[in-house]
């Protein structure tokens, strides 16, 4: 059972600061933006990150959504990383959720963050270079230390 | 009502592996709604979460000490146990047994309603 | 981890006062917030949960408001059975984490 408790709109940037933003395909994207960038491009680059309160004590549950024009929710549904349109559920009554990740610091670095999904136990977020493109995706944690895993989560509220 | 009763050794080597058991009586711990968890305090000190146990047996731990610890229960005993592994001094704390209201959207939940008395364990050769 | 911190430390006061201690949470903890009173050789034992809420058989000279990251735990009229150490704990979130603890002395 999870159940949502409070939100915060928040710029999500993975180590190399790149700013992840979702494109007018409804992408999750790493771009290089400044500050001025990543504001001009909003609400493209602000999160809204949904906590919730879990029946299970495994860390803070939160849900990643986006507000453009209708609001879009971060899924992993079989593995693949896309945003769906729907609203943050006020509760969810079941242990696992594509939607849910566990939001932690990383041992040794606050500021730095790892999701992990609620549905697939040892993947996490990730940023993967395919192309040109810095794309978000659900990777297995194969390595102690992958810094793809790492994210800095800036409050804007 | 529900108690608990902590019991084990009061004094381990450092290195050496602390174990102890905590006794519930006056219900069950394979009954649902509850975890079991164990609290520690060093000496004047303030209380430190180290982990709970679930009736179907899943463990959660604190991840400041989850390379070291484990939790299991014994339910033809109605006993939970810990176990924390290459201990030093630091480790030297009263540790308690404590019971957890379960959270399935409800209010009460997820503090410590029913504790044990403790028991100081000393880590010193 | 959610870090709790409360003030002040140490609080001195005197029967019949109104003592108020305070907690903060390092992030938003909803109304998840459980206050402890702790005295020397005993176990903790829960007085308020859900940050307001007060657990059966403890007396209504406790009471607990705040939500958010800012609590407080308010006594409205100091009892000798009192003096003891306060805790506040985050139970929004795991790992269960607690503020380092009030000590609450005659004055």
């Known amino acids: 059972y999870f159940g949502k408790l409070e939100s915060k709109l928040s710029v999500i940037r993975n180590l190399n600061d790149q700013v992840l933003f979702i494109d007018q395909g409804n992408r999750p994207l790493f771009e290089d933006m400044t500050d001025s960038d990543c504001r001009d491009n909003a609400p493209r680059t602000i999160f809204i990150i949904s906590m919730y309160k879990d029946s299970q004590p495994r860390g803070m549950a939160v849900t990643i959504s986006v507000k453009c024009e209708k609001i879009s929710t971060l899924s992993c549904e079989n593995k693949i990383i896309s945003f769906k349109e729907m609203n943050p559920p006020d509760n969810i009554k079941d242990t696992k959720s594509d939607i849910i990740f566990f939001q932690r610091s990383v041992p040794g670095h606050d500021n730095k963050m790892q999701f992990e999904s609620s549905s697939y136990e040892g993947y996490f977020l990730a940023c993967e270079k395919e192309r040109d493109l810095f794309k978000l995706i659900l990777k297995k944690e194969d390595e102690l230390g992958d810094r793809s895993i790492m994210f800095t989560v800036q409050n804007e509220d | 009502q529900v108690q608990l009763q902590e019991s084990g050794p009061g004094l381990v080597k450092p290195s050496e592996t602390l174990s102890l058991t905590c006794t519930v009586s006056g219900g069950s711990i394979s009954s649902g709604g509850y975890y079991w968890s164990w609290i520690r305090q060093p000496p004047g000190k303030g209380l430190e979460w180290i982990g709970s146990i679930y009736y179907s047996g899943s463990t959660y731990y604190n991840p400041s000490l989850k390379s070291r610890v484990t939790i299991s229960g014994d339910t033809s005993k109605n006993q939970f146990s810990l176990k924390l592994s290459s201990v030093t001094a630091a480790d030297t704390a009263v540790y308690y047994c404590?019971?957890?209201?379960?959270?399935?959207?409800?209010?009460?939940?997820?503090?410590?309603?029913?504790w044990g008395r403790g028991t100081l364990v000393t880590v010193s050769s | 981890d959610i870090q709790m911190t409360q003030s002040p430390s140490t609080l001195s006061a005197s029967v019949g006062d109104r003592v108020t201690i305070t907690c903060r949470a390092s992030?938003?903890?909803?109304?998840?917030l459980a206050w402890y009173q702790q005295k020397p050789g005993k176990a903790p034992k829960v007085l308020i949960y859900?940050?307001?809420t007060l657990e059966s058989g403890v007396p209504s000279r406790f009471s607990g408001s705040g939500s958010g990251t800012e609590f407080t735990l308010t006594i409205s009229s100091l009892q000798p059975d009192d003096f003891a150490t306060y805790y506040c704990a985050n139970i929004a979130f795991p790992p269960w984490t607690f503020g380092q603890g009030t000590k609450l002395e005659i004055k």
């Open positions: 404590a019971r957890t209201p379960a959270y399935f959207g409800q209010d009460r939940t997820d503090f410590f309603d029913v």
């Open positions: 992030q938003g903890i909803s109304s998840w």
């Open positions: 859900k940050a307001s």
